[in-house]
């Protein structure tokens, strides 16, 4: 009894190909010997056809290869273009063909199937519509249109003019009688499954006068269009089902080892939770189609993917469906940057968003995604310089370091910033990313003025306290705009005393306005950075006023050197500016955001490349 | 979902026949495989006979046991597979089950984990 095993008998037709898997037991000794596939003759002795070790025999030649998978113990024949002499007994095995393990398989190829002249084909993927054409004499138009199934030797009615409806084919199929004159009638079946294909028969009449019309329905699963994407990039699928299905609810399931299929995202609000914060299903055009985009593809997202159109918003039989195999490249081009960044309330976080290299002049985004329904991600910031109003003063996007990553900066955090956001531009889609923002304990390590009020043609000199461990990087003061956050001068002004553990590390640097003017009016940023790599940044509005005549309340230049922890209005200001002090937002109240351009002096930091050491600003 | 119900079952005698079948409701495919198991008392579940379709070529593979005397027979219908069982011995007494799944000739139809689907299955007693 051989350990080798197969399929005893294959059954083929003309012109097709098979794919004949023989299992061996996985030895070392086994894995590595010889395999091959012969034809035994009349004489007994099997000729090899084609081996593992290279060989293909002339009649093979361009159409059958072996493949040894040593791994799961098994090899693969493939035969293609068969022909009736491709019949006959063969054997698979390993080592010597006339000893050793082998495997007895009969082949059997056959003209296939013999259809009736004048038979018309119908080709049609599962799900859609077929119109079947049936032609009659005129002395038949008034009599009853019928269409059967043929099944083995009996015909079976699947429906006619007089209104039988075939009960496997309720709801989904009708008769159509055209107008006197047209000797054709039609019938047309939708949401084609696969028990529907088959031999049909189309008749008009009765008696040896009747007219007859053979139908070759053949309906075929969509053949998967496999994909292939790098690990920690973007994937998109196309669905176009059909204006049929154009108001029907639509989805994306991808099929399990049971297979069955797992909604993925549908129109109905419905989401696979492993897809969180990186998939979005973009509403459908007049024609019905759509797509669905996954970001941050993991290696675990690898499948069969099908898209389809159901009430239900679920696979259902006979509906049409769309099929990808997603393969995921874990050799991949895009590099690897942190899925996670953390930061605390009132700190800020600095992510790192790649993008192809290749394309350096692409627009660059950042959007927030947002979960309802089908998933949306609004554009917060872009690299031409528009930002979302609510996050004016606090969100920057920065063509630094460049080479294939951008920065966003976004300071001011509050609990409600903790969520998915979107690395995008305008070219290569395959690189969008996935960012998930949250916020933990802790205390912002850049220490500056809740808000601060300038009176003008006065001198103002902002703090900004950092810690120890901030001592090697770059510190510096810039004044945000809706394009980014013009550079300023600033001084080292020597040990802080808002951190008293480490005092000689622990240093203020501050921003001097002299005079202050009008156009000094806005978010000013102090941040720390180390090359064209971004760290924590801290915010302050300044708010400009006339100077006030003796008596009027206002901040004093000098009260905006206090302490962080000291309170920089006195106790007597009124509840709007309480309001104001909890969320410095509220300072720029309902404006347009302006390109504030070049103010106050100062250059932009010039776009350079290097490589990213950390991500986000979080403190310890 | 995919509903099997094997049918054709009961007592025979030593070299005697029978012809099971099992048919599948539910979703239908054009690329399957289907198999018969069967379990004896006190025994573990072996494969008997398998067929995979792909497309127009059908692979029949069958246990060494079995082998001349069980055979898939060609004349299956659509959703219905059959196994003609001949020469009948004591030793084919167990319940016998049919398995099916969707997909191609690329698992090894022997391994019941490779199906997805499994009838109640139906006795099958042979004395001598």
């Known amino acids: 009894k051989s350990p080798v095993f197969g399929p005893q008998e294959v059954s083929s037709v003309e012109g097709n190909s098979v794919s004949i898997k023989c299992y061996y037991p996985p030895t070392s000794v086994n894995r590595h010997t010889r395999k091959y596939w012969c034809r035994k003759g009349a004489s007994g002795r099997c000729i090899t056809l084609v081996s593992s070790e290279g060989y293909v025999s002339s009649n093979y030649a361009g159409r059958a290869n072996l493949t040894n998978f040593p791994e799961n113990g098994t090899f693969v024949v493939n035969i293609a273009q068969l022909s009736r002499d491709d019949s006959g007994h063969y054997k698979c095995g390993l080592g010597i063909n006339s000893r050793g393990l082998s495997f007895d398989v009969s082949l059997e190829v056959s003209q296939g199937p013999e259809l009736p002249n004048g038979t018309e084909v119908y080709t049609v993927d599962v799900g859609r519509t077929v119109t079947i054409k049936c032609p009659f004499k005129t002395e038949n138009a008034p009599k009853t249109k019928a269409l059967y199934k043929k099944i083995g030797q009996t015909s079976v009615l699947v429906i006619d003019s007089r209104n039988y409806v075939n009960p496997n084919y309720k709801d989904r199929i009708r008769l159509r009688i055209p107008g006197t004159g047209q000797l054709i009638f039609t019938v047309v079946i939708d949401r084609l499954r696969l028990s529907d294909h088959g031999l049909y028969l189309c008749q008009a009449g009765d008696g040896s006068n009747r007219d007859e019309k053979n139908a070759d329905l053949q309906v075929l699963e969509p053949e998967p269009e496999l994909v292939y994407e790098d690990l920690r990039g973007s994937v998109t699928f196309h669905c176009a089902l059909g204006l049929e299905v154009a108001n029907v609810a639509k989805f994306l399931c991808r099929v399990n080892s049971r297979e069955t299929c797992d909604v993925v995202i549908n129109t109905l609000g419905k989401r696979d939770s492993a897809f969180e914060g990186r998939i979005l299903l973009n509403p459908q055009d007049k024609d019905g189609s759509f797509s669905v985009v996954i970001t941050g593809l993991r290696k675990e997202d690898e499948g069969r993917y099908l898209c389809g159109a159901h009430s239900d918003g679920q696979l259902q039989e006979g509906w049409p469906i769309q099929a990808w195999q997603l393969f995921v490249n874990e050799e991949s081009t895009i590099p690897r940057s942190p899925t996670v960044v953390k930061g605390v309330a009132g700190g800020s976080v600095a992510v790192l968003c790649p993008y192809n290299p290749k394309e350096s002049q692409s627009l660059k985004y950042w959007c927030l995604w947002e979960g309802a329904q089908n998933g949306r991600c609004p554009l917060l910031v872009e690299s031409q310089g528009l930002v979302q109003e609510q996050y004016e003063g606090r969100l920057s996007l920065l063509q630094e370091p460049g080479n294939g990553t951008f920065t966003v900066i976004l300071n001011q955090l509050t609990t409600q910033d903790a969520g998915f956001y979107w690395c995008l531009t305008n070219g290569d889609t395959r690189w969008r990313t996935t960012v998930e923002i949250k916020i933990i304990e802790g205390e912002p390590n850049l220490k500056v003025p809740g808000n601060v009020t300038a009176v003008l043609g006065e001198t103002l000199n902002i703090p900004c306290h950092f810690p120890c461990k901030f001592s090697s990087y770059e510190k510096y003061w810039c004044k945000w705009s809706n394009t980014g956050c013009q550079t300023l001068p600033s001084q080292d002004e020597g040990p802080s005393e808002a951190f008293v553990n480490c005092d000689e590390n622990s240093r203020l640097v501050s921003l001097t306005l002299n005079p202050v003017t009008r156009a000094d009016e806005g978010w000013y940023w102090c941040g720390v950075k180390q090359g064209h790599f971004y760290g924590e940044t801290a915010a302050v509005y300044v708010a400009v006023e006339e100077k006030k005549v003796a008596g009027s309340r206002y901040v004093s230049p000098a009260k905006a050197d206090a302490a962080p922890d000291e309170k920089v209005l006195d106790s007597g200001v009124r509840e709007i500016e309480n309001k104001a002090i909890q969320d410095p937002r509220l300072f720029a109240e309902e404006k347009v955001v302006a390109d504030t351009g070049d103010q106050a002096g100062g250059s932009r930091a010039s776009v350079d490349s290097s490589s990213s050491e950390e991500q986000g600003g979080s403190s310890k | 979902q995919v509903q099997l119900v094997e049918s054709g079952g009961g007592s025979v005698q030593t070299g005697g026949s029978l012809r099971l079948s099992c048919t599948a409701s539910g979703r239908t495919f054009s690329n399957y495989g289907m198999g018969w198991f069967r379990q004896a008392p006190g025994k573990e579940r072996e494969f008997v006979a398998g067929?995979?379709?792909?497309?127009?070529?059908?692979?029949?593979y069958y246990a060494d046991a079995v082998k001349g005397r069980f055979t898939i027979p060609r004349d299956n219908a659509d959703n219905t597979i059959y196994l003609q069982m001949d020469s009948m011995k004591p030793d084919d007494t167990a319940v016998y089950y049919c398995?099916?799944?969707?997909?191609?000739?690329?698992?090894?139809?022997?391994?019941?984990?490779?199906?997805?689907?499994w009838g109640p299955g139906t006795q099958v007693t042979v004395s001598s």
């Open positions: 398995a099916a799944r969707q997909g191609e000739n690329n698992y090894d139809p022997r391994s019941g984990s490779a199906y997805n689907y």
């Open positions: 067929i995979t379709r792909s497309g127009r070529t059908t692979y029949y």
